[in-house]
Structures are given as C-alpha cells and as structure tokens.
Interface confidence: low
C-alpha cells in the first residue's frame, strides 16, 4: 500500500496556475503575483517576463501563461518571442552600426527594417525599365525593347551593383 502511494505523485493533481507547495504539505497553492505555471503538477511557478524599457506588453501575464512583449514605436522585434528590439529606419534607409543610412544609388528599401537591396535588373529578363527606381522603390520593368512600337523609348537601367564600401553593416 505504501509503495503504491509513493508512486502516485500528489502534485500531479495541481492544475496550471498553481504549484505544489512542499512547505504546506504538498497542497496546491495559487501562483504568487507576477508568476505563472502553464502546466499542471508544477512544484514552482515561473516569474513573469517583464516588458520594460524598449519592450512593451503585448499580452499580460496571467497565472497560467507568460507575458508576451513587443517593441515600443520606432522599434521592431527580432528573435524568437521578440527577444530583441531593433531601431526602425525610414523607407529608403538601412540600419548600420553608425545608425540609419540612406540606401546607396542602385539600391532600395521599401520597409522600416532590413537592408537596402539592389534594384531589379530588367535586362536580365529581356525587359526594359518602365519606371525608374528610387531609394524607397524598386524599378518597374516593362515589356522587352523588341515588344515596343517603333519610336517608343525606354529608360536605360542603371547598374544595380552597390557602390564600393557601402555594404550593409
């Protein structure tokens, strides 16, 4: 009988949101404030994640689930579970070690994050440039020069390569 009892863990009856309190004869106690247990049978509650500084609370901590953070305006999440916040830049810029820098000629970034990417080289697909690229927008490719009616002109595509010394950091 005693052997059977020892195999049955009394803590297994404690639901999520509680912990098995060894100091109180293994009764199920509610998780203290600012802590949680997401599964039953826990012997401790985990401390809630604190969304401080550049982080802000996206989902409150409850007794059964951890808080979830996102980033304050002007920053965006990086990493699993928003483990880091990275500064936003403007469209047409990229973040370097020295801060936000404009995209080099021939590259663009249409988002507030990420790096500047080369404009599409329309000629590789046998097409012509219909709309010039900018720091914020890629070029728009049009029909191939052979498809154009006589007298129509196309914009000469610029070289898509980055300028030397302007690789993303």
């Amino acid at each position: 009988f005693e052997r059977t009892r020892s195999l049955q863990d009394p803590c297994s009856n404690c639901p999520a949101g509680t912990f098995c309190d060894n100091n109180r004869n293994q009764i199920c106690s509610p998780c203290p404030p600012n802590s949680f247990s997401s599964a039953g049978g826990q012997r401790t509650c985990d401390i809630c994640r604190q969304c401080k500084g550049v982080f802000r609370t996206r989902k409150e901590c409850s007794s059964t689930s951890n808080a979830e953070c996102d980033c304050t305006p002007g920053f965006h999440c990086l990493g699993a579970g928003c483990s880091m916040c990275e500064q936003d830049c403007k469209q047409g810029q990229e973040l370097t070690k020295k801060g936000c820098k404009d995209c080099c000629f021939g590259t663009f970034n249409d988002q507030k994050r990420g790096i500047c990417r080369p404009w599409t080289n329309c000629s590789l697909d046998g097409k012509s440039v219909l709309v010039n690229g900018t720091k914020e927008r890629d070029v728009v490719c049009g029909p191939s020069p052979a498809d154009l009616s006589p007298g129509a002109s196309s914009v000469t595509p610029p070289a898509p390569a980055r300028e030397p010394g302007h690789s993303p950091q």
């Epitope: 949101g17 604190q50 401080k52 808080a67």
Partner: nanobody
C-alpha cells in the same frame, strides 16, 4: 482609456455594513489583479484588500480580516468590497486600484498599482 469608478460609500453607524463597488472600463478587467486602499484624513494611503486576476487568491490588511470581503465579477467588470462590523477607525476615502502586470514592490504598497479611481467616502459615526 482606463477608468475606475467607485460607488456605495456613505454614512453608517458602528457595527453597520456597506458594500462598495468599483466599475472598470477601457481595458481587459479580467486580466488584472485589483485592490482596495483607503485614506483617512491626514494619513497616508493604506492597503485594505487585494484579489488576484482570476479570484484565486486574496490578501487582507490585519485590521479588516474577518470583517471585509473582496470579490469581483469579471463578466460585469466590477470589483466589490463588502464591509461589515464597521468601526470609527474605518472612516476614510476608499479607492480601488488596478495592479500592474509587473512590480518589484509588495502587493500591499501603492506603487504596485497603476490606475486608481476617484474614491468614495465611508463615514462611520454614532
């Protein structure tokens, strides 16, 4: 916008009872712990009672244990404080407060709470 509005205060004789209510709006009431504090004339704000977000745990000041009961109705976004066996020393303005999601302070300190109501006056006199 977060709002807390207390009601139910008034004048009562010693030994009498009152039930205070705190109506919450503008946020997910059921996700937060709530508390009652009070402030007597010329004194600091004093912890009265606290209730966890899900009603799972309560805390009371020693001076009100056995006389006051804190409860909540998450469906109605309302916090309650049932006060009985009232004494003259219970005279104060009573405030409800929302517990911060995270705090390094003890749950009985005002710093643990981020939003407060305007208060309702409870007067106990013969």
């Amino acid at each position: 916008e977060v709002q807390l509005l207390e009601s139910g205060g008034g004048e009562v004789q010693p030994g009498g009872s009152l039930r205070l209510s705190c109506a919450a709006s503008g946020w997910a009431f059921g996700n937060y712990g709530m508390a009652w504090f009070r402030q007597a004339p010329g004194k600091g704000r004093e912890f009265v009672a606290r209730l966890a977000w899900n009603g799972g745990s309560t805390d009371y000041a020693e001076s009100v244990k056995g006389r006051f009961t804190i409860s909540r109705d998450n469906a109605k976004n309302t916090l309650y404080l049932q006060m009985s066996s009232l004494r003259a020393e219970d005279t104060a303005v009573y405030y409800c407060a929302r517990q911060r999601s995270y705090s390094r302070y003890d749950i009985r300190t005002p710093q643990t709470y981020d939003y407060w109501g305007q208060g309702t006056l409870v007067t106990v006199k013969p």
